[in-house]
Interface confidence: low
């Protein structure tokens, strides 16, 4: 399955929107920084494309879920958030189209299941952190910066997949 060129453009737009969403200075929130343990090894180059697509899909789905909550709506600019949802939704569609085309439809490798679970646990840690910090502006700013970091890493993986085609 060939991810369309518009998919990588959408990824870049998503990062730009995340950057624009910043409301306060991360530097005023240094004490709130947290290591969420992004499972980077699950996004390594050892993956076959069939294994990677569902992991990327899970990553984007979890970002969508995180920013679709009532607490998120209260934290961010509504217009930017709507644009952000649209970009994520389009990327999910692109990845789902790949799955439907047969990529990863065959017996799911255990490694892929483990990777999806690792991504879910990563987002559980983020959600728990937000709850513990009572969804404070600094907590959301720390999470926004973290999602920028992890999303850019997964974007790099998508680009490396394209270049291997």
């Amino acid at each position: 399955c060939d991810l369309p060129q518009t998919h990588s453009l959408g990824s870049r737009r998503t990062l730009m929107l995340l950057a624009q969403m910043r409301r306060i200075s991360l530097f005023s929130c240094l004490k709130d920084r947290h290591d969420f343990g992004f499972p980077q090894e699950e996004f390594g180059n050892q993956f076959q494309k069939a294994e990677t697509i569902p992991v990327l899909h899970e990553m984007i789905q979890q970002i969508f879920n995180l920013f679709s909550t009532k607490d998120s709506s209260a934290a961010w600019d509504e217009t930017l958030l709507d644009k952000f949802y649209t970009e994520l939704y389009q990327q999910l569609n692109d990845l789902e189209a790949c799955v439907i085309q047969g990529v990863g439809v065959t017996e799911t490798p255990l490694m892929k299941e483990d990777s999806i679970l690792a991504v879910r646990k990563y987002f559980q840690r983020i959600t728990l952190y937000l709850k513990e910090k009572k969804y404070s502006p600094c907590a959301w700013e720390v999470v926004r910066a973290e999602i920028m970091r992890s999303f850019s890493l997964s974007t790099n993986l998508q680009e490396s997949l394209r270049s291997k085609e």
Epitope: M16, A19, Q20, R22, S25, L26, F27, L30, R33, D35, Q40, A145, M148, R149, S152
Partner: antibody
Framework: QVQLVQSGAEVKKPGASVKVSCKAS????????IHWVRQAPGQGLEWMGW????????GYAQKFQGRVTMTRDTSTSTVYMELSSLRSEDTAVYYC???????????WGQGTLVTVSS | DIQMTQSPSSLSASVGDRVTITCRAS??????LNWYQQKPGKAPKLLIY???SLESGVPSRFSGSGSGTDFTLTISSLQPEDFATYYC?????????FGQGTKVDIK
């Protein structure tokens, strides 16, 4: 493409001030912080502080507190770093750098050599 | 302030060699560690951010590892264009601090 273009070399006397500019282009200026880092001849890199291009907020290293001022002009997408009460040990190349997020810099200016000599 | 200590301060190597540079922080900095390459008369160039993430456009022979206080930059097979000075930088807390640098020159 992203570019940070700095002003030219300066020679100053001890006790004077210097103002270095950094003009940004190729990205949305207000979305990113600009940091300043200096490097004395043959020495390592030293972080000076940051400027929030959006709000104009700043943060300076304790070492430079009271001597450094960072400002910006959003109409020209330019950030300025002014260092006062110059001494010979301020002789260095001064770099501006665009912060991606969480403190790493993907683009740097070409550097401005400031020489402090009597 | 967090002190960053790089070792070695200089090393001589040949093209094709595997090169390892270490960086130690005076306190835990999680994964807020970045690596830069600098050539004479030029601005630093970002290689690795967040301890192990390869910056876009940087050759895959560069890799970073570590978390907490101990970090490593590895060049798997040194190329002629890799002879330069390498700096680690912590971005865990301000003031952000750099290691003193490791100069890699030709043996």
């Amino acid at each position: 493409q992203v570019q940070l273009v700095q002003s030219g070399a300066e020679v100053k006397k001890p006790g004077a001030s210097v103002k270095v500019s950094c003009k940004a282009s190729g990205y949305t200026f207000s979305n990113y912080y600009i940091h300043w880092v200096r490097q004395a001849p043959g020495q390592g890199l030293e972080w000076m502080g940051w400027m929030d291009s959006n709000s104009g907020g700043t943060g300076y290293a304790q070492k430079f507190q009271g001597r450094v001022t960072m400002t910006r002009d959003t109409s020209t997408s330019t950030v300025y770093m002014e260092l006062s009460s110059l001494r010979s040990e301020d002789t260095a190349v001064y770099y501006c750098a665009k912060e991606v997020f969480s403190g790493w810099y993907d683009y740097w200016g070409q550097g401005t050599l400031v020489t402090v000599s009597s | 302030d967090i002190q960053m200590t790089q070792s070695p301060s200089s090393l001589s190597a040949s093209v094709g060699d595997r090169v390892t540079i270490t960086c130690r922080a005076s306190q835990s900095i999680s994964s807020y560690l970045n690596w830069y390459q600098q050539k004479p008369g030029k601005a630093p160039k970002l290689l690795i951010y967040a301890a192990s993430s390869l910056e876009s456009g940087v050759p895959s022979r560069f890799s970073g590892s570590g978390s907490g206080t101990d970090f490593t930059l590895t060049i798997s097979s040194l190329q002629p264009e890799d002879f330069a000075t390498y700096y680690c930088q912590q971005s865990y807390s301000t003031p952000y601090t750099f290691g003193q640098g490791t100069k890699v020159d030709i043996k």
